[in-house]
Interface confidence: medium
């Protein structure tokens, strides 16, 4: 829902969280605003207080229930409103009819760990967090490895076009410190986007054995 200099964007984590960002040029800093969620076929509604993340941008998380509870389905529509207090009144500043499974952004993968490391390769595994069982295996992943002297932005992206929660990194340099990140995206949803990157996993390849070509 966009109005010139106003933008209201929300994503569903596929379980029990809708995260929203509202940006509005010239909005009053000291105004109390909230996001109100009103599902079309559920008995609950939920609000969260918008907190500033920059001079003209506010964010909040609608917590719909326990982290792994399935609070919405593919047929749900949730009316999301930004309400700002003006005296005793609540004014509607932005509104959208939100289709949760068209606007997915999963939680970052967790529990990254080195399964096995050698001189030139490393096997890494991870887990997805709070992802709906509706996806079954319809997920994809992107991974990147930070090499010495480079930035994350320079790191080539490795794409896993299936639900594969491990990777074997090859052609690594012996006795070298690396960092690794992964992110996940469901195949479903017109406006679905990648999860945030996982926390980096640091690992070091084994040194080459002296006098041996490994």
């Amino acid at each position: 829902a966009v109005n010139g200099t106003s933008q209201f964007t929300c994503f569903y984590n596929s379980r029990a969280n809708i995260s929203c960002v509202w940006s509005q040029d010239g909005a009053l800093q000291d105004t109390s605003c909230q996001v109100h969620a009103w599902p079309d076929r559920r008995r609950w509604n939920q609000t969260c207080e918008l907190l500033p993340v920059s001079q003209a941008s506010w964010a909040c998380n609608l917590i719909l229930g326990a982290p792994d509870s399935q609070k919405l389905t593919t047929v749900d529509i949730v009316t999301l409103r930004v309400l700002c207090r003006e005296g005793v009144r609540w004014r509607v500043m932005a509104i959208q009819d939100f289709k949760p499974f068209e606007n997915l952004r999963l939680m970052a993968p967790i529990s990254l760990q080195v399964v096995h490391v050698e001189t030139h390769r490393c096997n890494i595994s991870w887990e997805i967090s709070q992802a709906s069982h509706y996806f079954e295996r319809h997920l994809e992943f992107e991974a990147r490895t930070l090499s010495p002297g480079h930035t994350w932005e320079e790191a080539p992206l490795l794409t896993l076009k299936q639900k594969q929660e491990w990777i074997c990194l090859e052609t690594l340099t012996p006795d070298t410190q690396y960092e690794f990140q992964v992110r996940v995206k469901p195949l479903q949803g017109e406006f679905t986007t990648w999860s945030p990157w996982s926390q980096p996993l640091a690992f070091r390849t084994k040194p080459a054995a002296l006098g041996k070509d490994t």
């Epitope: 109100h36 079309d40 409103r81 309400l83 009144r89 609540w90 004014r91 509607v92």
Partner: nanobody
Framework: QVQLQESGGGLVQAGGSLRLSCAAS????????MAWFRQAPGKEREFVAS????????DYVDSVKGRFTVSRDNAKNTVYLQMNNLKPEDTAVYYC????????????????WGQGTQVTVSS
């Protein structure tokens, strides 16, 4: 704020139908709960019907339930009042009103009003 312009009023016989339109301009229409009010000669202005910003909730005064239907087209920035089985007591000036106050539905304290359109129902 929005500016509102009603149209569609006129003279109709009892039992007939009219469709009122209210075109909005000047602001983001979808932010507003829209309502129709009416004022008959010598009487106070009264609430007729309302539709919330998303169009999901409508409300009617008891005297028009089952005869009048309020709707909105957010793509066209327009709210409608379909009036069927009109009665002489429906004769009044009909006003379109807009409000961004989330909890004000039937109140006369709507932010913005149109100029009104005359509906006359003859017996």
């Amino acid at each position: 704020q929005v500016q509102l312009q009603e149209s569609g009023g006129g003279l109709v016989q009892a039992g007939g139908s009219l469709r009122l339109s209210c075109a909005a301009s000047g602001d983001v229409f979808v932010r507003y709960t829209m309502a129709w009010f009416r004022q008959a000669p010598g009487k106070e202005r009264e609430f007729v019907a309302s539709v919330t910003d998303s169009g999901r909730t409508t409300d009617y005064v008891d005297s028009v339930k089952g005869r009048f239907t309020v709707s909105r087209d957010n793509a066209k920035n327009t709210v409608y009042l379909q009036m069927n089985n009109l009665k002489p007591e429906d004769t009044a000036v009909y006003y379109c009103a807009a409000n961004t106050d989330y909890f004000q539905i039937r109140s006369l304290e709507f932010n913005t009003w149109g100029q009104g359109t005359q509906v006359t129902v003859s017996s």
